[in-house]
C-alpha cells in the first residue's frame, strides 16, 4: 500500500470520438490501479505530443482499439 493515497489519474475530460489513427503517435491503455481507480485510454497525438483521453465505454473507441490492435498485429512478424 503506498504511503500517499493521492489519486494520480491523468484525464480531465474523456471523448467518445475516435481520433484519426494517422494522427496518433501512440495509444496507451492504463489499467485501474491503486494510484488511479479507473481505466484510462490516452491517445498521444503527433502534433505537439498532445494527450487526448478517450472513453473506454464508448463503442466508437472500442472499435478504434480493435482497428489499432489489428493494424499492429499485421505489422508484427
Amino acid at each position: 500500500v503506498p504511503l500517499s493515497r493521492t489519486v494520480r489519474c491523468t484525464c480531465i475530460s474523456i471523448s467518445n470520438q475516435p481520433v484519426n489513427p494517422r494522427s496518433l503517435e501512440k495509444l496507451e491503455i492504463i489499467p485501474a490501479s491503486q494510484f488511479c481507480p479507473r481505466v484510462e485510454i490516452i491517445a498521444t497525438m503527433k502534433k505537439k505530443g498532445e494527450k487526448r483521453c478517450l472513453n473506454p465505454e464508448s463503442k466508437a473507441i472500442k472499435n478504434l482499439l480493435k482497428a489499432v490492435s489489428k493494424e499492429r498485429s499485421k505489422r508484427s512478424p
Epitope: 489519486v7 489519474c9 484525464c11 480531465i12 475530460s13 471523448s15 467518445n16 505537439k48 483521453c53
Partner: antibody, heavy 118, light 110 residues
Framework: QVQLVESGGGVVQPGRSLRLSCAAS????????MHWVRQAPGKGLEWVAV????????YYADSVKGRFTISRDNSKNTLYLQMNSLRAEDAAVYYC???????????WGRGTLVTVSS | NFMLTQPHSVSESPGKTVTISCTGS????????VQWYQQRPGSAPTTVIY?????PSDVPDRFSGSIDSSSNSASLTISGLRTEDEADYYC?????????FGGGTKLTVL
C-alpha cells in the same frame, strides 16, 4: 445546445464563506472537465480551478489554494465552488466553463458576481 | 511562473486588418496549444481560436491564429474589421496543471 448557468453570488464580508453553483445542460456533463474562471471588475480573466469529469482530479490557482474547493455532482449536472476565508481581492464575476480536452475552455456561463465588503 | 503578455490596447479602422500578439514569458509557447477568446462588454467570453489556429464553426474566417516560435509568441489576426469586432481579446495556454490567461487586449474599431 450547451448551457451553463452560475448562481450563488452575492455580497459577503471578508473572512466569510460562499458556495457557487453552475447548472449544466445540453451535453453529457459526466464526460467533461469543468473550470471556474473569475474576472475582477475592470480587470482580465484569471483561472481559478479545474475538476476532472469524475471528480478525481482537482487543480487550483495558487491564489485560492487551501481556501477554495471545487466539486461536482454528476447526478445533478452541477459544478460547485466552495469559497472560504474570502478576501477583498476575491471580489469578481465568477464564470464556469467546459473543458473539452486538457487545454481549452469551449463554452462559458454568463457569470455570477461575488462582492466581498465589510 | 509562466505568463502571457498582450498589448493593452490596439485600434484600427473598419475594413482593415489587425494583429494582436501574445508572448510567453519562458519555455516555448509552441509546446502547448494557445486559445483566443473574445469578450464583448457585459458578456461572457467566447472562443474565436483554439489549438493555435483552429476556428469554431460559428466564427467567421476573418479570424485566424498563428504561432511564431522565433519570437515565442502567438498571434490573432482579424481581417476586414467590423464594428462588432470591438471587444477584449484574451489568449490562453496551459503549463503544468495551470491554465494561464494573457492580460487581455482591448480592440477599438475606429
Amino acid at each position: 445546445q450547451v448551457q451553463l448557468v452560475e448562481s450563488g453570488g452575492g455580497v459577503v464580508q471578508p473572512g466569510r464563506s460562499l458556495r457557487l453553483s453552475c447548472a449544466a445542460s445540453g451535453f453529457t456533463f459526466s464526460s467533461y472537465g469543468m473550470h471556474w474562471v473569475r474576472q475582477a471588475p475592470g480587470k482580465g480573466l484569471e483561472w481559478v480551478a479545474v475538476i476532472s469529469y469524475d471528480g478525481s482530479i482537482k487543480y487550483y490557482a495558487d491564489s485560492v489554494k487551501g481556501r477554495f474547493t471545487i466539486s461536482r455532482d454528476n447526478s445533478k449536472n452541477t459544478l460547485y465552488l466552495q469559497m472560504n476565508s474570502l478576501r477583498a481581492e476575491d471580489a469578481a464575476v465568477y464564470y464556469c466553463a467546459r473543458a473539452p480536452d486538457g487545454h481549452q475552455l469551449d463554452y462559458w456561463g454568463r457569470g455570477t458576481l461575488v462582492t466581498v465588503s465589510s | 511562473n509562466f505568463m502571457l503578455t498582450q498589448p493593452h490596447s490596439v485600434s484600427e479602422s473598419p475594413g482593415k486588418t489587425v494583429t494582436i500578439s501574445c508572448t510567453g514569458s519562458s519555455g516555448s509557447i509552441a509546446s502547448n496549444y494557445v486559445q483566443w477568446y473574445q469578450q464583448r462588454p457585459g458578456s461572457a467570453p467566447t472562443t474565436v481560436i483554439y489549438e493555435d489556429d483552429q476556428r469554431p464553426s460559428d466564427v467567421p474566417d476573418r479570424f485566424s491564429g498563428s504561432i511564431d516560435s522565433s519570437s515565442n509568441s502567438a498571434s490573432l489576426t482579424i481581417s476586414g474589421l467590423r464594428t462588432e469586432d470591438e471587444a477584449d481579446y484574451y489568449c490562453q495556454s496551459y503549463v503544468s496543471s495551470k491554465w494561464v490567461f494573457g492580460g487581455g487586449t482591448k480592440l477599438t474599431v475606429l
